[in-house]
C-alpha cells in the first residue's frame, strides 16, 4: 500500500513543497514520485520512505508516488493548489468629466489570480460596494451602471479583488486598481448670454459681459472671451451656480469693419459658445471750412460742412441738399454776421444704430468803426453843477478806441460821472480809429445856467 | 407726401408673395423705410429698414423670412414662405427724420401708409 | 439691443380722467422717442416725436417727457375719442435683431 504525506496542499505561485512517499512493505522494488515538477530527492535511512523537494510550482499539479511491493503495485496522489493574486486589476479608461444624469459603465479587468473559486471582484465607490461578483474568463470582468449625480463629484471608484484563503488556513489577499476620481458637471443647454455694444468707435474702451446660470460647479468652469482674434481678459464674478465674465476691449484703426464676438464656456468635456457681430467704425467728427475765419464786412464767405463719406449732414439745421456727406451755403458777411457759429451736425448709420457727431466754427466779422446818434448823440445839455455821465459808444470789430476831445486838447470823460461846470461846454471832436479805419462825429455840450429870482 | 402699399391677398401657406410700397411726392434716395406688421389681437411689430442706398436690417423674427429691396420710387417686401401665423395688416412708413435743433437725424415713422391685409390659409 | 418695456399692458380711464404710460429703454436713447396712438383699421397716428414735442394737429391734451432711459405720455381730459392703443418707438437703432416698439398698451374710456 502507498501513501502519500501531504495529501493536499495549498502553496504559492513559484513555491517549493516536501512530499513524502511511503510504502507498507518493508523491501519495495520500487519506490518513487512522478511530476513534471523539478524534484530533489532528500536521502533517508530505511527503504519504505522516501521524501522529495519540489520546486517552482506554476499551476496546480497532481503528484503520484507509486511503489513495487512483492503484493503488488499502487499509486497515491497529492494534490497541489497554486495561489497567487491578480497580475492586473484595472478599471476601463473613463474621461474623468462625467454630465450629471449620464449612465456611467464601469468596467473592471482582471488577469490572473488563482485559484478562481476563492477570487471575487469587487466595484466599490469609496468604500461603498456598488458589485461583488466571482471572478469569471480571463480576463475576467465585471461591470456596473452608475447614473452620474451631482453629489458623486470628486468621488473615487476603484476595484478590488479579493482571494479569500482562509478556509485553507492562510489569509484574505486584496488587490485595488488604480482610483478613478469622477468630476461631475453641468452645463446647461442654453448658450451663455452676451451683452455688448453693437457697434464701437475706433480708439474707444466698450465693455462686454458674458453670463450663464445654471452651472456646476461653476469654479471649474473656463470663460473664453475674443473679439475677432483678440482674447480678451475677463474679471470673473462667481455665483452659487453662476459666473459673470467683464472685459474691456480696446479697438484701432486695423480692427474696423465687422468683427465676432465669442464667449466661449468650457466645463468638462463640454461646451457653449455665443457669437455676436460688433461693428467697428471710424467716424471723425465733421469738418466746418470758413472760407477765412476773419473777413471784412462786405466779404463774400462760403462756410462748408464735410463729413464722413456716409454720413448725413445738415449747417446749421437745415439738411444737406441733395443728403449726403457735404453741405456748404453763401453770405455776405454783415456785422450781425460777427460772432456767428457755423454748425456742422453729421448723422452716421452703423450696422443699423445711429451715431451723431457735430463741430461748430465762429465767423470774425470786421467792420466800422461806426458812431451814431443811438449810441453817441451829437448834443448834450445839462444844467450847470449836475452830475452827468457823458455817453459815447463806438462800434466796430476790432472795439474802436475813442476820444472826445474839444479845441483838440481837452476831453470830454466818456463814460465817468462829472459834476458840470462851464468848462465843459463847447464842440466836442469825437474820434473813433481801429485796424479798419477812423470816423469822427462832432458832440456839443451846452450848460443851463442856474436862474436866480 | 404720401406712401401706398398694395399686394395683400389671400395666399396658401409657402406661396411667396410680394406686398409693394408706392412713395409718392417725396425721393427714396433720400429717405430710410421700414415695413411694420399688427396681426389680429396682436401689438405693432417691426419686421425691417431699407435704408437710402439699398442696406436692409431686420428684427431678429423676421430675418429669413422676410425681405425688402427698392426701386427709385417703390419698396417691396417679400414674405418668401409664409405660414398662417403670417396672417395680419403690412404697413410700410417713412423712416427717417431730422432734428433742426440739434441737426441730427434719426428714425421717426413720420409717414404711414393705409396698411394692406395678407391672409395666409390653407 | 434697446428693448423697450411699456407699462401698463391696459389701463382703464374715465371721460375727463387723466392717464400716465410709461416707456423704458434698456438703454439710453437720448431724446429719440416717439409715441403713436394706434386705433383699429387705420394706420397709427404719431403724436409725439423726440421725447417731447407735440406732433402737428395733435391736441394739447398730449404730454410727453423724459430722456435716456424712462419715458412718459401723458393724456389729460381724457375723451372718448382717446380709447385705443398707445405704442412708445424709439428712433435710435433699426439693427438687425432690434426690437423698436414698445409693447403697447390699451387705453380704455369709461
Known amino acids: 500500500q502507498t501513501s502519500v504525506s501531504p495529501s493536499k496542499v495549498i502553496l504559492p505561485r513559484g513555491g517549493s513543497v516536501l512530499v513524502t512517499c511511503s510504502t507498507s512493505c518493508d523491501q519495495p522494488k520500487l519506490l518513487g514520485i512522478e511530476t513534471p515538477l523539478p524534484k530533489k530527492e532528500l536521502l533517508l535511512p530505511g527503504n519504505n520512505r522516501k521524501v522529495y523537494e519540489l520546486s517552482n510550482v506554476q499551476e496546480d499539479s497532481q503528484p503520484m508516488c507509486y511503489s513495487n511491493c512483492p503484493d503488488g503495485q499502487s499509486t497515491a496522489k497529492t494534490f497541489l493548489t497554486v495561489y497567487w493574486t491578480p497580475e492586473r486589476v484595472e478599471l476601463a479608461p473613463l474621461p474623468s468629466w462625467q454630465p450629471v444624469g449620464k449612465n456611467l459603465t464601469l468596467r473592471c479587468q482582471v488577469e490572473g489570480g488563482a485559484p478562481r473559486a476563492n477570487l471575487t471582484v469587487v466595484l466599490l465607490r469609496g468604500e461603498k460596494e456598488l458589485k461583488r461578483e466571482p471572478a469569471v474568463g480571463e480576463p475576467a470582468e465585471v461591470t456596473t451602471t452608475v447614473l452620474v449625480r451631482r453629489d458623486h463629484h470628486g468621488a473615487n471608484f476603484s476595484c478590488r479583488t479579493e482571494l479569500d484563503l482562509r478556509p485553507q488556513g492562510l489569509e484574505l489577499f486584496e488587490n485595488t486598481s488604480a482610483p478613478y476620481q469622477l468630476q461631475t458637471f453641468v452645463l446647461p443647454a442654453t448658450p451663455p448670454q452676451l451683452v455688448s455694444p453693437r457697434v464701437l468707435e475706433v480708439d474707444t474702451q466698450g465693455t462686454v459681459v458674458c453670463s450663464l446660470d445654471g452651472l456646476f460647479p461653476v469654479s471649474e468652469a473656463q470663460v473664453h472671451l475674443a473679439l475677432g482674434d483678440q482674447r480678451l481678459n475677463p474679471t470673473v464674478t462667481y455665483g452659487n451656480d453662476s459666473f459673470s465674465a467683464k472685459a474691456s476691449v480696446s479697438v484701432t484703426a486695423e480692427d474696423e469693419g465687422t468683427q465676432r464676438l465669442t464667449c466661449a464656456v468650457i466645463l468638462g468635456n463640454q461646451s457653449q459658445e455665443t457669437l455676436q457681430t460688433v461693428t467697428i467704425y471710424s467716424f471723425p467728427a465733421p469738418n466746418v471750412i470758413l472760407t477765412k475765419p476773419e473777413v471784412s464786412e462786405g466779404t463774400e464767405v462760403t462756410v462748408k460742412c464735410e463729413a464722413h463719406p456716409r454720413a448725413k449732414v445738415t449747417l446749421n439745421g437745415v439738411p444737406a441738399q441733395p443728403l449726403g456727406p457735404r453741405a456748404q451755403l453763401l453770405l455776405k458777411a454783415t456785422p450781425e454776421d460777427n460772432g456767428r457759429s457755423f454748425s456742422c451736425s453729421a448723422t452716421l448709420e452703423v450696422a443699423g444704430q445711429l451715431i451723431h457727431k457735430n463741430q461748430t466754427r465762429e465767423l470774425r466779422v470786421l467792420y466800422g468803426p461806426r458812431l451814431d446818434e443811438r449810441d453817441c448823440p451829437g448834443n448834450w445839455t445839462w444844467p450847470e453843477n449836475s452830475q452827468q455821465t457823458p455817453m459815447c459808444q463806438a462800434w466796430g470789430n476790432p472795439l474802436p478806441e475813442l476820444k472826445c476831445l474839444k479845441d483838440g486838447t481837452f476831453p470830454l470823460p466818456i463814460g465817468e460821472s462829472v459834476t458840470v461846470t462851464r468848462d465843459l461846454e463847447g464842440t466836442y471832436l469825437c474820434r473813433a480809429r481801429s485796424t479798419q479805419g477812423e470816423v469822427t462825429r462832432k458832440v456839443t455840450v451846452n450848460v443851463l445856467s442856474p436862474r436866480y429870482e | 407726401q404720401s406712401v401706398e402699399e398694395s399686394g395683400g391677398r389671400l395666399v396658401t401657406p409657402g406661396t411667396p408673395l410680394t406686398l409693394t410700397c408706392t412713395a409718392s411726392?417725396?425721393?427714396?434716395?433720400?429717405?430710410?423705410m421700414s415695413w411694420v406688421r399688427q396681426a389680429p389681437g396682436k401689438g405693432l411689430e417691426w419686421i425691417g429698414i431699407?435704408?437710402?442706398?439699398?442696406t436692409t436690417y431686420y428684427a431678429s423674427w423676421a430675418k429669413g423670412r422676410f425681405t425688402i429691396s427698392k426701386t427709385s420710387t417703390t419698396v417691396d417686401l417679400k414674405i418668401t414662405s409664409p405660414t398662417t401665423e403670417d396672417t395680419a395688416t403690412y404697413f410700410c412708413?417713412?423712416?427717417?427724420?431730422?432734428?433742426?435743433?440739434?441737426?441730427?437725424?434719426?428714425?421717426?415713422?413720420?409717414?404711414w401708409g393705409p396698411g394692406t391685409l395678407v391672409t395666409v390659409s390653407a | 439691443g434697446y428693448d423697450m418695456t411699456q407699462t401698463p399692458a391696459s389701463v382703464e380711464v374715465a371721460v375727463g380722467g387723466t392717464v400716465t404710460i410709461k416707456c423704458q429703454a434698456s438703454?439710453?436713447?437720448?431724446?429719440?422717442l416717439v409715441w403713436f396712438q394706434h386705433k383699429p383699421g387705420q394706420p397709427p397716428k404719431r403724436l409725439i416725436y423726440?421725447?417731447?414735442t407735440l406732433a402737428s394737429g395733435v391736441s394739447s391734451r398730449f404730454k410727453g417727457s423724459g430722456s435716456g432711459t424712462h419715458f412718459t405720455l401723458t393724456i389729460s381730459g381724457v375723451e372718448s375719442a382717446d380709447a385705443a392703443t398707445y405704442y412708445c418707438?424709439?428712433?435710435?437703432?433699426?439693427?438687425?435683431?432690434?426690437?423698436?416698439f414698445g409693447g403697447g398698451t390699451e387705453v380704455v374710456v369709461k
Open positions: 411726392g417725396f425721393s427714396l434716395s433720400n429717405y430710410y
Open positions: 431699407i435704408s437710402d442706398s439699398g
Open positions: 438703454q439710453s436713447i437720448n431724446s429719440w
Open positions: 412708413a417713412r423712416d427717417w427724420s431730422y432734428d433742426s435743433s440739434s441737426g441730427y437725424y434719426y428714425y421717426d415713422m413720420d409717414l
Open positions: 423726440k421725447a417731447s
Open positions: 418707438q424709439q428712433g435710435y437703432s433699426r439693427s438687425d435683431g432690434e426690437h423698436v
